[in-house]
């Protein structure tokens, strides 16, 4: 870290490696919860016009698709993969693509994905063909 930039104690706004290199924060779609028309498709665009700088460099992009008897919503946020989101671990946080995986939630259909390339939660993928370790 350069001498003119203070290093504060317990600073989670800055992530460094062993050489002192600094991690830049992720750029993610961040519209919180919005109504969605995404249904029965292999993939969908988020239709979120807001790309935000994640507050902490360790955060990744997350998308949550929910369908119940009344509506469909899509949530786009930044989140720290060390912490659960909607009570689920972000197990795919290192993926460059947002591959939706179904989670068990009573009373609704619930899919969630996380990823770590810029704006990767803009394109959410439901197709089974991506659910193996696809290099693309």
């Amino acid at each position: 870290i350069p001498p003119h930039v203070q290093k504060s104690v317990n600073n989670d706004m800055i992530v460094t490696d062993n050489n002192g290199a600094v991690k830049f924060p992720q750029l993610c779609k961040f519209c919180d919860v919005r109504f969605s028309t995404c249904d029965n498709q292999k993939s969908c665009m988020s239709n979120c016009s807001i790309t935000s700088i994640c507050e902490k460099p360790q955060e990744v992009c997350v998308a949550v698709w929910r369908k119940n008897d009344e509506n469909i919503t899509l949530e786009t946020v930044c989140h720290d993969p060390k912490l659960p989101y909607h009570d689920f671990i972000l197990e795919d946080a290192a993926s460059p693509k947002c591959i939706m995986k179904e989670k068990k939630k009573p009373g609704e259909t619930f899919f969630m994905c996380s990823c770590s390339s810029d704006e990767c939660n803009d394109n959410i993928i439901f197709s089974e063909e991506y659910n193996t370790s696809n290099p693309d």
Partner: nanobody, 124 residues
Framework: EVQLLESGGGLVQPGGSLRLSCAAS???????RMWWVRQAPGKGLEWVS?????????YYARSVDGRFTISRDNSKNTLYLQMNSLRAEDTAVYYC?????????????????WGQGTLVTVSS
Amino acid sequence: EVQLLESGGGLVQPGGSLRLSCAASGFTFTEYRMWWVRQAPGKGLEWVSAIEPIGNRTYYARSVDGRFTISRDNSKNTLYLQMNSLRAEDTAVYYCAKQIPGRKWTANSRFDYWGQGTLVTVSS
């Protein structure tokens, strides 16, 4: 030699405006995503805003979105930050930094060349 030189900081009252500049030299400005980053006294770094090298696509932290505007003049190798509706919590040293788009980490322990910073104080 790579240099980033920030200027334009100062004392301003709450609700006021300031325009910061960052003059870049020693590298191909149009190859880099540029950032404004700030550090309040005793706090960590906060990543304020970024702008792509070409096309001028911009990004903001939620804390400043709608109040701050980042821009760049590639012909002058200069980065700008227009800060409006300033608040006491915007008080910080403001740095500019460069990032190769797509690279998640700086190249070395000097933050891939950061400037020395310019102090912005918002107080009545």
